[in-house]
């Protein structure tokens, strides 16, 4: 099944591997965490993927953290779990959903300037896939802490959303992460329906902006499960 072996390169949302597309002839629209199979005008979603294994929070999506799926479970078996919403219990910042941080064991709303975590001095990409630079330079990127006086602009390499400028989040782009725009009202978003269901999205989207949530578009309620379009909508 999908994601059972990372090196098999069987990746969720393929093709669309991407977490969604615009609706126009010759493309399907997907915001659901399945796989869309293009073929004429018919698309079906397969929802039998496995949770994405991880070693650290940075390997998970913006709305997930890395932990053992069972309380007191085997520390060696960790997967990406859905982030904890406001007022939920937590042990560290990464457990809390974007816009929140862990304070006294509870996820609370963070102010704009709250830094969600220490920045590692070095980014190393730990996936089994080859990622060569187009100019042949080293893959290892050392980040000077001085760089972080100015937050990352769109397209900058990042480790987490706090590395990015206001209005941007840190989202996966192939086997790296870059700053991408936080989604605005009406934009297509990716809804992860099950805890740990998210897997590895090669072209990951940001989360919806403040005051917005990712919900099924009203005129898509009647559509089949496979074609339900999620967009950022006012609470």
């Amino acid at each position: 099944t999908l994601n059972s072996v990372l090196n098999s390169n069987a990746i969720k949302n393929l093709p669309p591997p991407l977490g969604g597309a615009a609706g126009h002839p010759g493309s399907a629209v997907s915001a659901a965490p399945g796989i869309l199979y293009p073929g004429g005008n018919k698309y079906q979603t397969i929802d039998n993927y496995q949770p994405y294994p991880c070693a650290e929070d940075e390997e998970c999506g913006t709305d997930e953290y890395c932990a053992s799926p069972t309380r007191g479970g085997d520390a060696g078996v960790q997967i990406c779990l859905a982030c904890r919403k406001r007022r939920k219990r937590c042990m560290r910042h990464a457990m809390c959903c974007p816009g929140n941080y862990c304070k006294n064991g509870i996820c609370v709303s963070s102010d704009q300037n709250h830094f969600r975590g220490e920045i590692e001095e070095t980014i190393t990409e730990s996936f089994g896939n080859d990622h060569s630079t187009l100019d042949g330079y080293s893959r290892r990127t050392t980040l000077s802490s001085k760089m972080y006086h100015t937050k990352g602009q769109e397209g900058s390499v990042c480790l987490r959303s706090s590395d990015c400028a206001s209005g941007l989040c840190c989202a996966r782009h192939f086997w790296s992460k870059i700053c991408k725009p936080v989604l605005k009202e009406g934009q297509v978003c990716t809804k992860h329906r099950r805890k740990g269901s998210h897997g590895l999205e090669i072209f990951q989207r940001c989360y919806c902006g403040e005051g917005l949530s990712c919900r099924i578009q009203k005129d898509h309620h009647q559509a089949s499960n496979s074609s339900r379009l999620h967009t950022c909508q006012r609470h």
Epitope: L18, T133, L134, I178, K180
Partner: nanobody, 117 residues
Framework: EVQLVESGGGLVQAGGSLRLSCAAS????????MGWFRQAPGKEHEFVAG????????YYADSVKGRFTISGDNAKNTVYLQMNSLKPEDTAVYYC??????????WGQGTQVTVSS
């Protein structure tokens, strides 16, 4: 809206070569990068190769490393996949996909590649 059109697929003998092209039209936003994916009959989709305009990097699946080369021109909205030393197990429909900065992702209809032994 962005439309992706793949070409260059076909029937080739094992050990042969093919060059796939993918042209994007209608782009109004910048693209972060493009990639090639494939689906063989009865199998799941898999990532083949990708190119990030943003980071200036290329990415390959282990199964094609050293045989396939992705290249492209962001200004011309085009990406290529040079496939050498083709094997029967490379037989699949190959799809081109694009990650756009407008939060939409697009892909083409696919092109069939058949490698005979």
């Amino acid at each position: 809206e962005v439309q992706l059109v793949e070409s260059g697929g076909g029937l080739v003998q094992a050990g042969g070569s093919l060059r796939l092209s993918c042209a994007a039209s209608g782009r109004t936003f910048s693209s972060y990068g493009m990639g090639w994916f494939r689906q063989a009959p009865g199998k799941e989709h898999e990532f083949v190769a990708g190119i990030s305009w943003t980071l200036g990097r290329t990415y390959y699946a282990d199964s094609v490393k050293g045989r396939f080369t992705i290249s492209g021109d962001n200004a011309k909205n085009t990406v290529y996949l040079q496939m050498n030393s083709l094997k029967p197990e490379d037989t699949a429909v190959y799809y081109c996909a694009s990650n756009e900065s407008d939060a939409y992702n697009y892909w083409g209809q696919g092109t069939q590649v058949t490698v005979s032994s």
